[in-house]
């Protein structure tokens, strides 16, 4: 039985040329944490594997950087960063859990960033 | 230890396609990418595409999209690499090879002898 | 694309001899994330297929000989093997994995002399 849950920083925008930390963090479960992996829509940012470190994507190498943690920071922002953004966690003996986090990227010079929030 | 093993020699007539196979063992097929390399007669090497078994994430040589198809099933830890509308110039050996993130291709196939002629 | 420049195409070598080999890249492969260089050394025997020497531009690979080492960053590298050995006439690749589609060299055959 899956118990655990995925907290991640939700709903988030940040400027045109900036950077943002998109961050999430599994509670509620003692499942060991094989592999995270960082998706944007359907395409592969980066994977952290327990044991073999970082793997980020070569099409994203100019603008993702590791972490902190098993988190991922987005670089020179553009309007086109724009969207949804998973992490997924691959535990055992649990299983997968996934977590979203929207990203808007605005032209302005304010950016708030919104509430953080639970997926189950 | 460490082994990918690939399928047979093929002959091939133009226009045909070709299924080859990498049969992974020694390690968690699912950690690491699968690449595939081809290399001509007494050419160069020439990166096709890649898939990562684990998610099944794929990315492809714009040289070959649309003819090269990469497919991983990791009940066997088998992956395949299906090129199609063959032409002479395809005529190589097919290398797959694991790689992750910083390691670069630390294991290599034996290669897989492909010759395309009418 | 990254173009991957090789130089010299071919050499004449002896058994004993130092052998430098230069790879130039057409953009850096410095990733500033972990001040890595993401270029690899592979050798290349006739029939066989490549082997891995060197990755990160100057990490030797596991079981590999010391006499191979690698050096250089951001757009520029170099291969050198300290003393020939009999068994070290074959052809050498670099290769970038920084940014798809990843490419190699055209390669150095190293000859007997």
């Known amino acids: 039985m899956m118990t655990g849950t995925i907290e991640t920083t939700g709903n988030i925008s940040a400027e045109k040329g900036g950077s943002i930390i998109l961050q999430c963090h599994l509670s509620s479960t003692t499942a060991q944490v094989t592999q995270v992996n960082w998706e944007q829509q359907d395409q592969l940012l980066a994977i952290c594997n327990a044991d073999l470190g970082w793997h980020i994507s070569p099409s994203f190498k100019d603008r993702v950087a590791p972490g902190p943690g098993l988190g991922l920071t987005l670089q020179s922002l553009t309007v086109n960063d724009t969207g949804e953004y998973f992490c997924i966690y691959h535990t055992y003996p649990d299983g997968t859990y996934t977590g979203r986090i929207f990203l808007e990227v605005l032209e302005s010079s304010v950016a708030e960033h919104g509430a953080r929030f639970q997926i189950p | 230890q460490v082994q990918l093993v690939q399928s047979g020699a093929e002959v091939k007539k133009p226009g045909a396609s070709v299924k080859v196979s990498c049969k992974a063992s020694?390690?968690?097929?699912?950690?690491?990418?699968i690449l595939w390399i081809r290399q001509a007669p007494g050419q160069g090497l020439e990166w096709m595409g890649d898939?990562?078994?684990?998610?099944?994430?794929?990315n492809y040589n714009e040289k070959f999209q649309g003819r090269v198809t990469l497919t991983a099933d990791t009940s066997s830890s088998t992956a395949y690499m299906e090129l199609s509308s063959l032409r002479s110039e395809d005529t190589a050996v097919y290398y797959c090879?694991?790689?992750?993130?910083?390691?670069?291709?630390?294991?290599w196939g034996q290669g897989t002898l492909v010759t395309v002629s009418s | 694309d990254i173009q991957m420049t090789q130089s010299p195409s071919s050499l004449s070598a002896s058994v004993g001899d130092r052998v430098t080999i230069t790879c130039r890249s057409s953009?850096?492969?410095?990733?500033?994330?972990?001040?890595?260089?993401?270029l690899a050394w592979y050798q290349q025997k006739p029939g066989k297929a490549p082997k891995l020497l060197i990755y990160?531009?100057?990490t030797g690979e596991s079981g590999v000989p010391s006499r191979f080492s690698g050096s250089g960053s951001g757009t520029d590298f170099t291969l050198t093997i300290s003393s020939l050995q009999p068994e070290d006439f074959a052809t050498y690749y670099c290769?970038?994995?920084?940014?798809?589609?990843?490419?190699f060299g055209q390669g150095t055959k190293v000859e007997i002399k």
């Open positions: 990160w531009a100057s």
């Open positions: 290769q970038q994995y920084y940014s798809y589609p990843f490419t």
């Open positions: 953009q850096s492969l410095l990733y500033n994330s972990n001040q890595k260089n993401y």
């Open positions: 020694g390690y968690t097929f699912t950690n690491y990418w």
């Open positions: 090879t694991r790689y992750y993130g910083p390691y670069a291709m630390d294991y």
């Open positions: 898939i990562y078994p684990g998610g099944h994430y794929t």
